[in-house]
């Protein structure tokens, strides 16, 4: 999160997270500015001349949707300033002189999660935004799966699923005869060879995907796919 010291009696803490494509969602902790003040955040690119993007706060939140030509790249770097009007005059305070979107990533959840049941196993596949495909090797997934009648808190988890958009669940991991549900979330992976800490992508898990339901297959011998395990 990004903390900006305000001009008033209380400081403001802003958290701005990006989906690593075209959207930056910001949330702030001190929305009480009075009626009609219409505060906003201004993102000014430290690299692209004239690259400014306005984020108008509604309550405690705002969203910037960047133009298509400004799709986020790893080296992007913004100055964030907070603007509001008091007594008819615009007040400006610095929130962050060097906001690096790659350090504040919250991706959109994976989409189109599907199951394909065959003898002895279930193959799960999913999709990511085409805009993220160049970063496939940087994406890490976590799978949660459970019997349909169970709460998600009871789900089994599998993580460290990196760089693939499929997964095999063996029948022995599931309860035969029961309908199961699975869901998935994604984050930027921390790679072993990322020796320069400043260059890493960091952030948090996406929201969970829409779940998929499937009937557990009958148990047989383990399947070893020709392409190896993920």
């Amino acid at each position: 999160s990004v903390t900006g010291e305000g001009q008033g009696p209380r400081s403001r803490t802003f958290t701005c997270l990006t989906n690593n494509i075209l959207r930056i969602d910001c949330h702030w902790s001190a929305p009480e500015l009075g009626q009609g003040s219409s505060p906003w955040l201004l993102f000014t690119s430290n690299q692209a001349p004239g690259g400014t993007h306005k984020c108008i706060l509604r309550g405690s939140e705002c969203t910037v949707v960047l133009p298509p030509e400004a799709v986020l790249v790893p080296s992007d770097n913004f100055t964030i300033t907070f603007h509001h009007c008091m007594s008819g005059r615009e007040q400006v305070s610095l929130v962050d002189p060097e906001y690096l979107p790659r350090r504040h990533v919250k991706l959109d959840p994976p989409s189109d999660l599907q199951s394909n049941i065959s003898s002895g196993h279930c193959i799960l596949t999913w999709s990511i935004s085409p805009a993220l495909e160049p970063m496939t090797t940087l994406l890490s997934y976590e799978l949660a799966f459970k019997k349909q009648e169970e709460a998600w808190e009871q789900a089994q988890h599998r993580d460290h699923i990196v760089g693939v958009t499929w997964l095999i669940l063996e029948a022995f991991e599931l309860d035969p005869g029961f309908i199961h549900e699975a869901r998935l979330r994604v984050q930027m992976a921390t790679l072993e060879d990322d020796v320069v800490e400043e260059e890493r992508y960091t952030g948090q898990w996406s929201e969970w995907s829409q779940p998929v339901c499937f009937q557990a297959p009958q148990r047989q011998g383990p399947l070893i796919p020709p392409w190896g395990w993920p």
Partner: nanobody, 125 residues
Framework: QVQLVESGGGLVQAGGSLRLSCAAS????????MGWFRQAPGKEREFVAA????????YYADSVKGRFTISRDNAKNTVYLQMNSLKPEDTAVYYC??????????????????WGQGTQVTVSS
Amino acid sequence: QVQLVESGGGLVQAGGSLRLSCAASGRYFYTYGMGWFRQAPGKEREFVAAISNEGGSTYYADSVKGRFTISRDNAKNTVYLQMNSLKPEDTAVYYCAAGRWYYYGPEYQITYRYWGQGTQVTVSS
């Protein structure tokens, strides 16, 4: 910031060959689509060729198809343009560009965020 440095330009006779290189700095080179553009004197900068981040897709202007080949080596952070059967009308300054393809196609300059300084290619008849 991604920095791009072109090399390999020069003077060549018509029918000859040149290989341009573009060396990129930056940790995430393999996430960028790369393109070559050129600008002849008195003309606008035009698309020549492009290659996707992993190298699996390539794109060419009609005027260079079959003569030019774009390739990349992500381990070396370098993209190449092999130019064969050069013609006098290929004379131009050649620019390397890097961008994250999203909305606009690889032939559009607006797709590219970073540009090199250019290398001169002169084809004499």
